[in-house]
Interface confidence: low
């Protein structure tokens, strides 16, 4: 290409501005958007070969307009070549305030590490300025419109653009992507590459063999009718500069997941077990949900299996509504769109003892006037094995009178089935309820028993008792 590796002085767009003496040497300064130009010298006529100025601030009407000379316009070159180009301007001496020339690309100022030099050619009429720009080993990202900006007397002047077109091997803007597909189900792959130079032609490759005999113009969509095993696909992009090959992508066939592993019990209570697991390989398809299977371990025969469904994430589930002090076998299975995995290895887990499920029975309350105490008696409730070992009772007694309300409770050990509590208020009603306590917690309170505490020594009580329900312990 004519413009590649060309000397700077051959790149000047049009003749050098003004007439320079034969032995005149320019002086140069590295480019800076803040550089000040040297003071102008003497007046000179304005050259005709100039670009129409693009004014972005109010221009002074008292001075002749200045504008950049026409640029080279369009440079075409191959990747990795060097390119040099310039913009130039003539500033008559009548202009007192001039700032340095700045280079812009695609609307953004080029600051920092760009090789640019500004050369000044002063004479008696003013100064000619040539801003030289070079790019070593151009890349596709150097493609674009370059232009110069300069402020003269607070007026911003913009040069015509120089379009730099870098040609090279095809460049992928869309490569095929790895996908996971259902066995024997059709799917599409897309490949798109661009120049310049155009056109770009695409060949598809499957497991190192070309799929299409004739190339397709980019962009290309390959429809694969279906696969029965994993395959690797890529695409070749061809243009006049040569060939580029995309990354190879694996197309995986979806299968059922592997079973979960590392099933652990994180916490147990009387009626729940918190279980965690590590999902197995997902079979190239996202896990959708998991199933926790629970069966009683103590049953001699194969008891029924309880199934609890949950989302695939988090890998955690609290199994509820279990019996207290019971042993269970637990396993986990997960599914994807293809199907369910095998179950994980079964693990053993136990619930802790529960709280009593029945309240104490036959509660009676008497007032012992002489000692000013209430005598409370009851019958031990029928506590099941899984309710745990009885450790005591809680007695709730509430005292109510005209202006007073007192709610108190006592805990007594399991020895015996009676208790005495001091009278708190006279001329009041006392309501008594009792609950049994095991290591698993506190059970339900009994039905309330009321007794009226007289002001003096008269007693009117209801020694009502709670009826003993049938023993349900089997």
């Amino acid at each position: 290409e004519k413009w590649e590796e060309t000397e700077l002085d051959q790149l000047f767009s049009g003749p050098l501005p003004g007439r320079l003496p034969v032995n005149h040497r320019p002086f140069s300064a590295p480019h800076s958007s803040r550089d000040q130009l040297p003071p102008p010298q003497t007046g000179r006529s304005h050259p005709a070969h100039t670009a129409a100025p693009q004014v972005t601030s109010t221009a002074s009407k008292l001075l002749p307009p200045v504008a950049f000379n026409h640029t080279i316009g369009h440079i075409v070159l191959s990747e990795h070549k060097n390119v040099k180009f310039n913009c130039s301007i003539n500033i008559p001496n009548t202009y007192q305030e001039t700032a340095g020339i700045s280079w812009w690309k695609d609307g953004k100022e080029l600051l920092g590490a760009h090789h640019s030099i500004t050369q000044f050619y002063p004479d008696e009429e003013g100064v000619s300025i040539i801003a030289l720009f070079s790019i070593a080993s151009v890349q596709r990202s150097d493609n674009g419109s370059y232009f110069c900006k300069m402020k003269v007397n607070n007026r911003e002047i913009v040069s015509d653009p120089i379009y730099v077109e870098v040609q090279g091997l095809p460049y992928f803007i869309k490569q095929p992507e790895s996908v996971n597909v259902t066995r024997n189900t059709a799917f599409n792959l897309t490949c798109q590459a661009v120049g310049p130079p155009e056109p770009v032609n695409i060949f598809w490759v499957q497991n190192s063999s070309r799929v299409n005999e004739k190339p397709e113009r980019s962009p290309s969509v390959l429809t694969v009718p279906g696969l029965t095993e994993t395959a690797v696909f890529s695409c070749e992009a061809h243009n006049d500069k040569g060939l580029t090959v995309s990354k190879g992508v694996h197309i995986n066939i979806k299968v059922i997941p592997s079973p979960p592993t590392e099933v652990h019990i994180l916490n147990s209570t009387a009626h729940s077990i918190l279980v965690s697991w590590v999902p197995g390989f997902d079979g190239y398809s996202p896990l959708q949900n998991c199933s926790i299977q629970v069966k009683e371990a103590d049953r001699l025969s194969n008891g029924s299996v309880m199934v609890f469904n949950t989302s695939a994430s988090p890998h955690l589930y609290e199994i509820q509504q279990l019996q207290a002090l019971a042993n269970y076998s637990i396993a986990v299975s997960c599914r994807n769109e293809i199907g369910w995995s095998a179950v994980s290895p079964w693990i053993l887990a136990s619930t802790t003892e529960g709280a009593p499920s029945v309240a104490p029975l036959n509660i009676t309350v008497f007032l012992n006037e002489s000692n000013n105490i209430l005598d409370i008696r009851w019958t031990k409730p029928p506590i099941k094995r899984q309710d745990g070992e009885l450790v005591g009772y809680r007695i709730s007694h509430v005292w109510e009178s005209a202006g007073t309300y007192k709610e108190l409770s006592e805990e007594v050990s399991q020895n015996g089935s009676w208790a005495q509590i001091p009278v708190q208020i006279h001329n009041a009603t006392c309501t008594v309820r009792i609950a049994a306590i095991t290591k698993g917690g506190i059970g339900p309170f009994s039905e309330p028993v009321n007794i009226i505490i007289p002001e003096h020594s008269k007693v009117d009580y209801a020694p009502s008792s709670t009826p003993a329900p049938g023993n349900t312990d089997s």
Partner: antibody
Framework: QSVEESGGRLVTPGTPLTVTCTVS????????MGWVRQAPGKGLEYIGF?????NTYYASWAKGRFTISKTSTTVDLKITSPTTEDTATYFC?????????????WGPGTLVTVSL | DVVMTQTPASVEAAVGGTVTIKCQAS??????LAWYQQKPGQRPKLLIY???NLASGVPSRFAGSGSGTQFTLTISDLECADAATYYC????????????FGGGTEVVVK
């Protein structure tokens, strides 16, 4: 890696003076260089910077009063028309990168005295 | 150009103590701020760059923080050798806004 200034001396007002900074152990095509001065008993004052590709930047007060240029191993600071206010120790310093103007290696400084 | 204002101008602290120096920029400079230490008759030494990054060989007793317009240099476990003048400097878009230094803070160690 080191930098060293030279060329500081007594000059009369209006007489141009160039101070030179010589570098070793690194390339001026990779790193920028800055100039900073310090008047006696005063603080540091940034003058300007030349980046790895030769672009020069100046503090607003220094534009027109100073010119920075470089060769492959030296960086020059020209005081175009010194005044007595330019009496100071002049430091050159290596930038952290091509266009980064923080200075990780400093020279010992060279004293410029401007006096009648 | 950006103007850097440094406070206080002087600070005194005991050995083992902590000193905090503040630097304010006249406009946002991101994190493009450096701190230097200069002892009498010596060249400046880079302590911190990019507001909080410790320069090579600088002890971790020196710490920088801040962004935008407000910056701080903290020197903890003061040593006698820390007696010096400390300067902040912006290098944000140095081509546009300059590389101004703050006025300096003299640290006196008792």
């Amino acid at each position: 890696q080191s930098v060293e200034e030279s060329g500081g001396r007594l000059v009369t007002p209006g007489t141009p003076l160039t101070v030179t900074c010589t570098v070793s152990g690194f390339s001026l095509s990779v790193y920028g260089m800055g100039w900073v001065r310090q008047a006696p008993g005063k603080g540091l004052e940034y003058i300007g910077f030349i980046n790895n590709v030769g672009n020069t930047y100046y503090a607003s007060w220094a534009k027109g009063r100073f010119t920075i240029s470089k060769t492959s191993t030296t960086v020059d600071l020209k005081i175009t028309s010194p005044t007595t206010e330019d009496t100071a120790t002049y430091f050159c310093a290596k930038g952290g990168g091509g266009d980064w103007g923080y200075f990780n290696i400093w020279g010992p400084g060279t004293l410029v005295t401007v006096s009648l | 150009d950006v103007v850097m204002t440094q406070t206080p101008a002087s600070v005194e602290a005991a050995v083992g103590g902590t000193v905090t120096i503040k630097c304010q920029a006249s406009q946002s400079i991101g994190n493009a701020l450096a701190w230097y230490q200069q002892k009498p008759g010596q060249r400046p030494k880079l302590l911190i760059y990019a507001a909080s990054n410790l320069a090579s060989g600088v002890p971790s007793r020196f710490a920088g923080s801040g962004s935008g317009t407000q910056f701080t240099l903290t020197i903890s476990d003061l040593e006698c050798a820390d007696a010096a003048t400390y300067y902040c400097q912006t290098y944000y878009a140095i081509n546009r806004y300059g590389g101004a230094f703050g006025g300096g803070t003299e640290v006196v160690v008792k």
